[in-house]
């Protein structure tokens, strides 16, 4: 024999204060004839939430038209939710009787609980820059969510990371919770344009996770490589020497030329270019006057990058009538 079933599909319904909650209830039969009522709680002390026939329920509306004879949808909406509304709600079928209706069957119940959305995740990187091949830590924090169950993932350029530790506080019962996660990321030389993303998924977000981001450009320092070369062509009594500073980040860079140990104060021509990976190249040209010099000229290009120790590269110009071999070496 077919029998009426009361279907309440959601075991748990998370709602936010001030919002409207929809409690679903459908039936599989129009028989026995009689009304469907909503209660909170069970037993003699249960609270009547909605009765279509009698009573005043200003915050409750029905989803369907209950006056339609073959309606099977008895879902209700409760507006302006407050903390006092939490509890388990039951839709209950009554059989028409005399002198009064008799309870026939109850739905399994839907527990209404207050949910709070997590705040937007904030991602913080290291206080100081680090060079490639080293590991840096990023922290992600989100607060004020409930219930406690939450999922946090880390990504670097869309690839999920696995080296992280996460804590949710407090461990016991609370009105709201916080999450803090620390991820360890190995820096690559091309990470100037990279991003780390912290993604937080929570039941209150309805499948639309929150994301916080940090740019690795603020955590990385790519040290430059130096090369000093002498141009093969001589312009009268002047030789053009080039110092190429390649693949550095950030842009902060000081370059000085020294001639036989003496710092040159005069203006030099230079250009700055940006590479596709976000690093920079700096080229500086230095004109050496060799008209009446007999000694070898040693030129030094010294670069101080992002407040780090200076690095330099030397080039010895052997100044003879025929301009003999060039040699260069580097000094840290």
């Amino acid at each position: 024999e077919e029998e009426l079933q009361m279907i309440q599909p959601e075991k748990l319904l998370l709602v936010t204060v001030g919002k409207t909650a929809t409690l679903h209830c459908t039936v599989t039969s129009l028989l026995p004839v009689g009304p469907v009522l909503w209660f909170r709680g069970v037993g003699p002390g249960r609270e009547l939430i909605y009765n279509q026939k009698e009573g005043h329920f200003p915050r409750v509306t029905t989803v369907s038209d209950l006056t339609k004879r073959n309606n099977m949808d008895f879902s209700i909406r409760i507006s302006s939710i407050t903390p006092a509304d939490v509890g388990t709600y039951y839709c209950v079928k009554f059989r028409k009787g005399s002198p009064e209706n008799v309870e026939f069957k109850s739905g399994p119940g839907t527990e209404m609980a207050l949910g709070a959305k997590p705040s937007a995740p904030v991602v913080l990187g290291p206080a100081a820059r680090t060079t490639p091949e080293h590991t840096v830590s990023f922290t992600c924090e989100s607060h004020g969510f409930s219930p406690r169950d939450i999922t946090l993932k880390w990504f670097k350029n869309g690839n999920e990371l696995s080296d992280f530790q996460t804590n949710v506080d407090p461990t016991g019962q609370s009105v709201a919770y916080s999450i803090r996660s620390t991820a360890r990321v190995v820096l690559d030389p091309w990470d100037v344009r990279s991003q780390v993303i912290c993604e937080v998924a929570h039941v209150t977000l309805q499948g639309d996770p929150l994301r916080g981001t940090a740019n690795l450009s603020e955590a990385i320092r790519v040290p430059p490589t130096l090369e000093v070369t002498q141009q093969p062509m001589r312009v009268g009594n002047q030789v053009n020497v080039t110092c190429q500073v390649r693949k550095f980040y950030p842009q902060s860079l000081q370059l000085t030329w020294s001639e036989n140990g003496n710092v040159c104060q005069r203006e030099t021509a230079s250009t700055l270019t940006e590479n596709k990976d976000g690093t920079y190249n700096w080229t500086s040209w230095f004109l050496v006057n060799i008209s009446d010099q007999r000694d070898d000229v040693v030129l030094t290009c010294q670069v101080k990058h992002d407040g780090q120790l200076a690095v330099s590269k030397r080039l010895a110009l052997e100044v003879t009538v025929h301009q003999k071999d060039q040699s260069s070496d580097a000094t840290p």
Epitope: E2, T28, S29, L31, V63, K68, N70, M72
Partner: antibody, heavy 119, light 107 residues
Framework: QVQLQESGPGLVKPSQTLSLTCTVS??????????WSWIRQHPGKGLEWIGT???????FYNPSLKSRVTISVDTSKNQFSLKLSSVTAADTAVYYC???????????WGQGTTVTVSS | DIQMTQSPSSLSASVGDRVTITCQAS??????LNWYQQKPGKAPKLLIY???NLATGVPSRFSGSGSGTDFTFTISSLQPEDIATYYC?????????FGGGTKVEIK
């Protein structure tokens, strides 16, 4: 006066998803208390109820098809649709959409569309 | 599922005859029963709802009665345009189910 018109492919390959749309004209699909249904009729056979969606959005499906059926409403287009996944030759039938107004009983029907499942 | 058994499966009658079709439900469905007419190549048409109420625009020669498990559909005076297959449908329990149909022909 409300009229219904089914549309969709007449031929579907086995294991694919059958998708049909019912366009409602002469009235609003979202005005209560109408219920919107899909019914099918196998060649030379009787009628089989597939499922119903209320104007409220609640859906009711035939348990024999429930795992494969989705009925949805697009109020902006004044349409409701049927999706039946993993079809076989046994799903070959004439598919009807129908409306139930205030009174019980499906009082407005589409003219029906024949769907054949074959490779 | 509720089984709806219609009888006869087909019948032949003369114009002006009284035609009766019965529908039996496998369990009590109160009066949650509809009757439909389907002409060849056409969609079904609602004739009777809630076992005995005539749908809008349906001629008064059609009527329905019954409650519980046994229902009757009657055409008081058969007309040539009544050639069709007639179906009962219960909506007391999900899934809604139809009878197997009764094909009415003119002698």
């Amino acid at each position: 006066q409300v009229q219904l018109q089914e549309s969709g492919p007449g031929l579907v390959k086995p294991s694919q998803t059958l998708s049909l749309t019912c366009t409602v004209s002469g009235g609003s699909i979202s005005s209560g208390p109408a219920y919107w249904s899909w019914i099918r009729q196998h060649p030379g056979k009787g009628l089989e109820w597939i499922g119903t969606i209320y104007y409220s959005g609640s859906t009711f499906y035939n348990p024999s098809l429930k795992s494969r059926v989705t009925i949805s409403v697009d109020t902006s287009k004044n349409q409701f649709s049927l999706k039946l996944s993993s079809v076989t030759a046994a799903d070959t039938a004439v598919y009807y959409c129908a409306r139930e107004g205030y009174h019980s009983g499906m009082d407005v029907w589409g003219q029906g569309t024949t769907v054949t499942v074959s490779s | 599922d509720i089984q709806m058994t219609q009888s006869p499966s087909s019948l032949s009658a003369s114009v002006g005859d009284r035609v009766t079709i019965t529908c039996q439900a496998s369990q009590d469905i109160s009066n949650y029963l509809n009757w439909y007419q389907q002409k060849p190549g056409k969609a079904p048409k609602l004739l009777i709802y809630d076992a005995s109420n005539l749908a809008t625009g349906v001629p008064s020669r059609f009527s329905g009665s019954g409650s519980g498990t046994d229902f009757t559909f009657t055409i008081s005076s058969l007309q040539p345009e009544d050639i069709a297959t007639y179906y009962c449908q219960q909506f007391a329990y999900l899934p809604w189910t139809f009878g197997g149909g009764t094909k009415v022909e003119i002698k």
